[in-house]
């Protein structure tokens, strides 16, 4: 006998429409109804909703609302999770790494954790540790292969080894960054006595009996001499290695300095020679600046003269060079001896070699050359074309030849055409035209005609010009244009109104204002007429202010 | 490095049209012509025409009446039609690329292929 | 059309020696505005497509030994195989591209004496 299902308590989530539903239960085996899942609880399929099934062994999902645990709820300092899913459900499990120099509290390089019913089994952890270091004709004490932070490793010397004076055992801690040193022990008889002494010199430390080898010491030289060679001295195989010399520094003489003198120099000349290490003040000519770009500065004496050797370099100014075309954007007015200074070429110019920017060079007599910005062409778009040769760049005057696709030709009959690169930019385009787009002369109009002398053929998108003949008005676009072979709407030229003396009398009427005996007006023009002396008016008043209509103009009349 | 492969049938009917396409892999097919050049079996090479990637094409003038050359971009190929042909047209035909957008020479040459002309 | 004539029609020389080819166009192939010879030299052996040797007259392509060589300008042009070697023996074209249609000239045999 199928069982009916009771009304199914969902822990964590609900039956939807739990309450109209109730009374519906039992239900029988195959019914299935909608639920959903309170928050951090998901369906078995991973929704938020899915169905309850009553089957034959009652309700399923027999769990319908697992556990969710949120990867933004672990907090692994020194660690990452690199798995990619955000949400992990009830027993699902997530591996965790440390950083190099970090471990788990099982000293493992990764752990896991897993999604419990309360959340994370635990947070995860990964300590600072340190790797068994490599000992040096030593050993460990203990056996670990991880140490964590302030762990303390004690090792001890092999025989006739020894870590510092007379100890033959010593320790090592983990650090933040590491062991606080290695684990070395030195051959006994590789360590030094005090290191030898020198001439004119001494050591910066205060010597010791023993040295350890590799161990290094410094030496300084007294004043007025001059340290020659290596100024440390190391402890190997029981030995000291070459240590320096102190050599008496030489006077220097009175400096000549080109370009610029000493201060005070006539009261200075007779205090020369002067011993090493002196210094004195100068100033440089007008033109001419120390290295260090000032007008004046210090020259020393030193062991090998004076320094610095040229003690007043050649300057150069910005304002000395003319660049048409071109501009400097280097904000220093001022450049001295080898000094290199950019320019660049104005949008369409460049450098003789096509480049976009050139720099010249400040030397002894002055800027190495003027800059010169030369007028250049880009390669253009070709149209229905191709180039035939290769550059990137056209200086004025140059030529660039092209040819035409199959089917298209620049003018009647050519499928090849040259531009030249002048100072607005290329003559023109290099264009070809589908043939078959071309026109024929453009259509001959009734008192009118083209402005421009006819060719025989139009290239498309060519316009001409129409004009009437005097007193005609022009109707429609002056314009034509050539497209898909075939010209646009020419315009027409409209018949002028011809107000002739005949017609007047004829009416007994005359031109208000005006004595002239043939009048020409254009469409749209009015015309006032007014009776002849003696005459009165026979049609209305509106007559006689008549309107030229394409030729047509009807006179007033007077009795 | 640039691939050129001819593919066509081998075997044409007098009178009846000859269709090639030559399919470009491993390289940019855009920026350059890319040329139909023909040779008859013991003799020289013959420039067909070129065809570059926008559609534009130039003809030896004294096949152009019979030739139509196109591109196909979106699959990196271009073909070559041979209309009305005689025992005369027999040869291997080859796709090449000419190196730049001006005049220039052929520096990639697919392997060719051979078109007899029979009943 | 600009007509390719290259000289010899075939040429024997033996291993190690010299061989040069000539090729004449019947009009210049020198473009004023890039001072550059639009002349290229190919060789092409049994089966197999023609490959590209020389361009611009005496530029050597990419991975061509350099015994090979190209001179000439304007319409007299000469390929040069310093000292010759087995793997040489094929037919060498030159090729004009500076107008089209686009010409090579009629071949010429290289064979090892």
């Known amino acids: 006998e199928v069982k009916p299902c009771d009304f199914p308590e969902i822990q964590h989530g609900g039956l939807y429409y739990k309450s109209l539903r109730r009374l519906y239960f039992p239900a029988a085996a195959g019914q299935s109804y909608s639920y959903y899942c309170d928050q951090n609880f998901v369906t078995p399929s991973g929704s938020y909703w899915d169905y309850i099934h009553c089957t034959q062994d009652g309700w399923s999902p027999t769990v319908p609302c697992l556990r969710t645990c949120s990867k933004s709820d672990v907090e692994i300092e020194n660690g990452f999770i690199s798995e990619s899913s955000s949400i992990y459900i009830l027993n699902e499990e997530t591996q965790y790494n440390c950083k190099p120099g970090y471990a788990t509290a099982e000293g493992n390089s990764s752990g896991s954790i897993t999604c419990l019913q309360n959340g994370w089994s635990t947070q995860p952890i990964c300590i600072k540790f340190c790797d068994m270091p490599v000992f040096e004709n030593s050993r460990a004490k203990s056996n670990g292969m991880w140490f964590k932070l302030h762990d303390t490793l004690d090792y001890e010397c092999y025989d006739g080894y020894e870590s510092s004076y007379g100890n033959t055992t010593d320790s090592i801690v983990c650090g933040e960054d590491g062991w606080s040193h290695l684990p070395t022990c030195y051959n006994s008889s590789e360590n030094c006595g005090p290191p030898p002494p020198i001439s004119n010199g001494d050591t910066t430390s205060f010597p010791q009996k023993v040295y350890l080898p590799w161990s290094r010491v410094e030496y300084q030289c007294q004043s007025y001499y001059e340290l020659q060679g290596s100024k440390y001295v190391t402890c190997s195989n029981g030995d000291w290695s070459e240590p320096p010399r102190c050599i008496s520094m030489k006077p220097c003489e009175f400096p000549e300095i080109q370009h610029g003198h000493l201060y005070y120099e006539n009261t200075r000349r007779p205090y020369f020679p002067v011993a090493t290490g002196q210094s004195y003040s100068y100033y440089c000519d007008q033109n001419f600046v120390t290295p260090s770009g000032s007008y004046w500065d210090y020259i020393h004496c030193t062991q090998d003269g004076w320094l610095p050797t040229v003690p007043c370099l050649r300057t150069c100014s910005k304002s000395d060079i003319e660049i048409e075309n071109g501009f400097i954007s280097e904000s220093s007015s001022i450049y001295i001896l080898n000094k290199e200074i950019q320019y660049k070429c104005k949008p369409g110019y460049a450098t003789a070699d096509g480049n976009s920017s050139g720099s010249i060079t400040c030397l002894q007599n002055g800027w190495s050359a003027q800059p010169i910005c030369i007028k250049f062409c880009d390669m253009p778009v070709f149209e229905n074309s191709r180039a035939k040769s290769n550059g990137m760049r056209f200086k004025l005057h140059d030529t660039l030849d092209y040819e035409c696709y199959d089917g298209y030709e620049i003018s009647y009959g050519n499928t090849t055409g040259s531009i030249v690169c002048g100072e607005d930019g290329w003559s023109h385009f290099p264009t070809c035209y589908n043939s078959s787009e071309k026109c024929g002369p453009p259509p001959p109009i009734s008192n009118g005609d083209t402005t421009s002398f006819l060719l025989k053929v139009y290239v498309p998108q060519s316009r001409v010009e129409y004009q009437c003949q005097s007193y005609y008005e022009l109707q429609g676009s002056n314009y034509v244009t050539c497209s898909n072979g075939e010209w646009s709407e020419p315009p027409r030229c409209i018949h002028p109104c011809i107000i002739t003396e005949e017609n007047m009398n004829k009416n007994n009427i005359q031109l208000k204002g005006k004595s002239d005996i043939k009048y020409y007006a254009k469409t749209g023009d009015t015309i006032e007429f007014m009776c002849k002396l003696g005459y009165n008016a026979n049609t209305s008043v509106l007559s006689f202010q008549a309107v030229c209509r394409e030729g047509i103009v009807e006179y007033p009349r007077c009795e | 490095q640039v691939q050129l492969q001819e593919s066509g049938p081998g075997l044409v009917k007098p009178s009846e049209t000859m269709s090639l396409t030559c399919t470009v892999s491993?390289?940019?097919?855009?920026?350059?012509?890319w040329s139909w050049i023909r040779q008859p079996p013991g003799k020289g090479l013959e420039w067909i025409g070129y065809?570059?990637?926008?559609?534009?094409?130039k003809s030896n003038p004294s096949l152009k009446s019979r030739v139509t050359i196109s591109v196909d971009t979106s699959k990196n190929q271009f073909s070559l039609k041979l209309s009305s042909v005689t025992a005369a047209d027999t040869a291997v035909y080859y796709c090449?690329?000419?190196?730049?957008?001006?005049?220039?020479?052929?520096?990639?040459w697919g392997q060719g292929t051979l078109v007899t002309v029979s009943s | 059309d600009i007509v390719m004539t290259q000289s010899p029609d075939s040429l024997a020389v033996s291993l190690g020696e010299r061989a040069t080819i000539n090729c004449k166009s019947s009009?210049?192939?020198?473009?004023?505005?890039?001072?550059?010879?639009?002349l290229a030299w190919y060789h092409q052996k049994p089966g197999q497509p023609p490959k590209l040797l020389i361009y611009?007259?005496?530029t050597r392509e990419s991975g061509v030994p350099d015994r090979f060589s190209g001179s000439g300008s304007g319409t007299d042009f000469t390929l040069t195989i310093s000292s010759l070697q087995a793997e040489d023996v094929a037919v060498y074209y030159c090729?004009?591209?500076?107008?089209?249609?686009?010409?090579f000239g009629q071949g010429t045999k290289v064979e090892i004496k």
């Open positions: 090449a690329r000419e190196r730049y957008e001006w005049n220039s020479y052929f520096d990639y």
């Open positions: 491993g390289g940019s097919f855009t920026g350059y012509y």
């Open positions: 611009w007259a005496s």
């Open positions: 065809v570059h990637y926008s559609g534009g094409t």
């Open positions: 090729q004009q591209y500076y107008s089209s249609p686009r010409t």
């Open positions: 009009q210049s192939v020198l473009y004023s505005s890039n001072n550059k010879n639009y």
